[in-house]
């Protein structure tokens, strides 16, 4: 039995690790699933952040794992992306859904960040150059669309390269190759890693490598 407290919990089950799998919510002491109507990257971002798996990788419209059972607690979940918990997102009401079945259980793939790397290249030292990120074993770049000093600040801090001195686009440090992992990132400058900034999803972009972004950090400028 329970004695009050917030009667809601969140978990991902039947995935490869605690940061992927079928979305399950515990409401009123009962675990249930979330229907995938209207499922979005914003909802996935909220879930990943809530579970301490801050990188939203993808939002499968159905759980890649086996179908769930029991109650379907949420449907038509609509998040802005900045909610602190999934149940702060709008939905149809608890236990209310439009004839969903467990074949429509929503799934999430986050990253715990342990398989991610970042580096700066072609800048003459480790603290300046083109931004490259290793994700799923492949090095790729970041598009310069809407890139600004807040993004640069996150990168410099993450790489322990001091503060951001400048940022550049238009492949100022040469064109990279491979995937373009990020486009239209939204950072406030306080994130602990670039992939914790709000984004559209890994590999989602409308760019080419002529738009690869770069930065110069204070420790890199000192070495120039």
């Amino acid at each position: 039995s329970s004695l009050g407290g917030t009667d809601k919990e969140l978990r991902l089950v039947d995935g490869e690790n605690k940061c992927s799998g079928r979305v399950e919510v515990k409401v009123q002491e009962e675990w249930g699933t979330v229907c995938n109507n209207g499922w979005s990257m914003e909802a996935v971002s909220v879930i990943c952040n809530q579970l301490g798996c801050p990188t939203a990788i993808k939002a499968p419209g159905w759980a890649n794992s086996s179908a769930g059972s029991g109650r379907i607690w949420m449907d038509h979940v609509s998040c802005r992306g900045n909610e602190s918990a999934l149940w702060d997102c709008k939905h149809d009401g608890w236990g209310k859904h439009s004839n969903c079945t467990h074949q429509q259980d929503a799934g999430v793939t986050c990253s715990d960040g342990s398989n991610l790397e970042m580096r700066l290249t072609r800048g003459g030292n480790m603290c300046s150059g083109r931004i490259e990120i290793k994700f799923q074993g492949r090095w790729g770049t970041v598009c310069d669309d809407n890139f600004n000093i807040d993004h640069a600040s996150v990168i410099c801090r993450q790489l322990e390269c001091g503060s951001a001195v400048s940022f550049s686009g238009s492949s100022n440090f040469g064109e990279g190759s491979g995937p373009i992992w990020f486009d239209d990132l939204i950072c406030n400058g306080n994130e602990s890693a670039l992939w914790n900034c709000k984004h559209q999803g890994w590999g989602k972009h409308n760019c080419d490598h002529a738009e690869d972004a770069g930065v110069i950090c204070s420790k890199g400028a000192d070495l120039s």
């Epitope: 039995s1 329970s2 009050g4 407290g5 917030t6 009667d7 009123q28 149809d92 608890w94």
Partner: antibody, heavy 116, light 107 residues
Framework: DVQLQESGPGLVKPSQSLSLTCTVT?????????WNWIRQFPGNKLEWMGF???????SYNPSLKSRISITRDTSKNQFFLQLNSVTTEDSATYYC?????????WGQGTTLTVSS | SIVMTQTPKFLLVSAGDRVTITCKAS??????VSWFQQKPGQSPKLLIY???NRYTGVPDRFTGSGYGTDFTFTISTVQAEDLAIYFC?????????FGGGTKLEIK
């Protein structure tokens, strides 16, 4: 359709235990829903007391601490409220209420007076 | 526990009037607010759940709105049969708590 009917003693002496029964018709209490007790004090203030789920899990209002117990008899399709060490402050109309999550279905209520 | 502060306590209106009742939560309850109607001598009945969703069979003159801490319940055109006490209630966290009620009287 779900129908709920409360029954109880009407009058209880202070320090005694209160036992109320909710008889459910038209629906099995093991099929679905949370089966709640809610009381309404004179002056109309409502207080959620606790529930027992269709699977038998219970949850209680912390304000009632260790005084409350909700149980059920599935063979009779009934669930019960026991409240120990009652005082005059427990005088109220007691409702049994059910629903998936929301308080959809209400009984008519039974009035309890605590008095010596 | 989350405290739900409901205003006003009493409303005296004429048939045909528009009525608004407000409920303020002591902390954010997201969209998780329900509204109930209790007619004299009856048990409460669910009118609105999840801020704005009308329960089955509830007339469309009853509406709800709000988010976070501030919520509103409106009867667009009051009818004589709407004489009742109206309660808000938060569904966000346990224990679920109710407002103190608004008694609606018809002139």
């Amino acid at each position: 359709d779900v129908q709920l009917q409360e029954s109880g003693p009407g009058l209880v002496k202070p320090s005694q235990s209160l036992s109320l029964t909710c008889t459910v018709t038209g629906y099995s209490i093991t099929s679905d829903y949370a089966w709640n007790w809610i009381r309404q004090f004179p002056g109309n203030k409502l207080e959620w007391m606790g529930f027992i789920s269709y699977s038998g899990i219970t949850s209680y209002n912390p304000s009632l601490k260790s005084r409350i117990s909700i149980t059920r008899d599935t063979s009779k399709n009934q669930f019960f409220l026991q409240l120990n060490s009652v005082t005059t402050e427990d005088s109220a109309t007691y409702y049994c209420v059910s629903g998936t999550y929301y308080f959809d279905y209400w009984g008519q209520g039974t009035t309890l007076t605590v008095s010596s | 526990s989350i405290v739900m502060t409901q205003t006003p306590k009493f409303l005296l209106v004429s048939a045909g009037d528009r009525v608004t009742i407000t409920c303020k939560a002591s902390q954010s309850v997201s969209h998780d607010v329900s509204w109930f109607q209790q007619k004299p001598g009856q048990s409460p009945k669910l009118l609105i759940y999840y801020t704005s969703n009308r329960y089955t069979g509830v007339p469309d003159r009853f509406t709800g709105s709000g988010y976070g801490t501030d919520f509103t319940f409106t009867i667009s055109t009051v009818q004589a049969e709407d004489l009742a006490i109206y309660f808000c209630q938060q569904d966000y966290s346990s224990p679920r708590t109710f407002g103190g009620g608004t008694k609606l009287e018809i002139k």
